[in-house]
């Protein structure tokens, strides 16, 4: 409550998160031209990536291009790479959408399809849709513990969202457990009216807002966080404007003294923790 006589000060905050959960992933792979279903277990180290600032990331889906090495190969067929003769390719050309440097040759990709040859990590990553349903659809059952320390230096007051004696086996609930700092990912999405399984396919950005409205006067002391959630990415984004949230990373290895890599296009949810509020004191 805004008391006119109070001196207000904005919150200074630090955040630390811990994600927990295990996912069973059923991946379809092609081995010697035969499709196989591979079961694997993903733990925290497999699906989280270190992020800067007050954010954490959870992988929910992925596409793999295995056994890439640096050599010459035909581009993946697209409108920009298909060609009918060498004239449709240009030596040294680097298209922003391309994965390599053109050699100037138009070569057979497959059957009667011809594409421009490139010097790149080959084979070139295919242009394909993210798997449906998401491979880590079960990530909605993962939980995140949010540790939030706050400070009002002008009022010489420090506190945190986790107080001694808190039941650490709790799960946040808007009405039944509003002070619990452990959040089930699926519940966060339910709160914003979004379907976790839908967002998990292409990825997205979710805001976790922590609002501190602190009255630091001795007789009316109140300083507890209020949690709310907000979808931050544009869910109406047109396909051509890259909906969702994804990035690529590679795992490098050597095979017969040749450097190779597995390229992984990762789709997932970035959670941004937004801490704001004020502390007022007479």
């Amino acid at each position: 409550s805004d008391k006119l006589y109070q001196r207000k000060e904005p919150v200074i905050s630090s955040v630390h998160t811990k994600v927990k959960g295990i996912a069973e992933v059923k991946e379809e792979i092609v081995e010697n031209g035969v499709k196989k279903l591979v079961h694997s277990v993903f733990d925290t180290a497999d699906y989280t990536f270190p992020l800067q600032g007050n954010s954490f990331f959870v992988m929910t889906n992925f596409l793999k291009t295995e056994g890439q090495e640096q050599r010459l190969c035909p581009e993946y067929p697209t409108r920009r790479t298909l060609c009918s003769s060498d004239r449709g390719c240009k030596k040294g050309w680097m298209d922003p959408q391309s994965k390599g440097i053109q050699t100037g040759r138009c070569v057979v990709y497959e059957g009667n399809q011809k594409t421009c040859e490139v010097s790149a990590w080959c084979p070139i990553e295919a242009v394909e849709e993210a798997p449906r349903p998401a491979l880590l659809n079960s990530a909605e059952n993962f939980t995140v513990l949010i540790k939030n320390n706050i400070d009002f230096p002008g009022h010489n007051y420090t506190t945190r969202n986790i107080l001694p004696g808190l039941n650490i086996t709790c799960t946040f609930h808007k009405t039944q457990n509003p002070q619990c700092p452990i959040f089930r990912l699926g519940d966060i999405f339910r709160e914003t009216g979004d379907n976790f399984s839908d967002v998990a396919i292409q990825g997205g950005i979710m805001g976790i807002e922590i609002y501190w409205d602190c009255n630091l006067d001795r007789w009316f002391h109140h300083c507890r966080p209020k949690y709310s959630f907000r979808r931050l990415d544009d869910k109406t984004t047109n396909v051509s404007l890259y909906p969702g949230y994804n990035f690529r990373y590679a795992k490098y290895y050597k095979e017969n003294n040749v450097e190779k890599r597995t390229l992984i296009k990762v789709f997932g949810i970035r959670f941004d923790i937004l801490v704001f509020g004020t502390g007022g004191k007479f």
Partner: nanobody, 129 residues
Framework: EMQLVESGGGLVQAGGSLRLSCAAS????????MGWFRQAPGKEREFVAA???????DYGDSVKGRFTISRDDAKNTVPLQMNSLKPEDTAVYYC???????????????????????WGQGTQVTVSS
């Protein structure tokens, strides 16, 4: 979806001239590179001429110096002026459009049929000797 309608085809004597026109509708015309292709019976579709959204042009080797492509962004049309016509110019002429909204089509790609998303139904040109 972009609709393309060709007109101006017909029968002409060798050495004569014809002016084809392509009328576009349904999309922001000025964001598209426009091309003319032709296909003679039993042959592959062949590049004739193209003009990018910013006015850069390219011509097929067999029509250089005889054909001229232009564009009228106010009328959403792409005329193709064909002079000194030869019997080997006989074919169905198609108009095509390539989206340049997210970036220009490189000049060396303007002749590639794969760059073009939208195609007209074609207009017949017959050159008699």
């Amino acid at each position: 979806e972009m609709q393309l309608v060709e007109s101006g085809g017909g029968l002409v004597q060798a050495g004569g001239s014809l002016r084809l026109s392509c009328a576009a509708s349904g999309r922001t015309f000025r964001h598209y590179a426009m091309g003319w292709f032709r296909q003679a019976p039993g042959k592959e579709r062949e590049f004739v001429a193209a003009i990018s959204s910013y006015g850069s042009t390219d011509y097929g080797d067999s029509v250089k110096g005889r054909f001229t492509i232009s564009r009228d962004d106010a009328k959403n049309t792409v005329p193709l002026q064909m002079n000194s016509l030869k019997p080997e110019d006989t074919a169905v002429y198609y108009c095509a459009a390539a989206d340049e909204t997210l970036g220009a089509v490189p000049n060396f790609r303007l002749h590639e049929k794969y760059e073009y998303e939208y195609w007209g139904q074609g207009t017949q040109v017959t050159v008699s000797s």
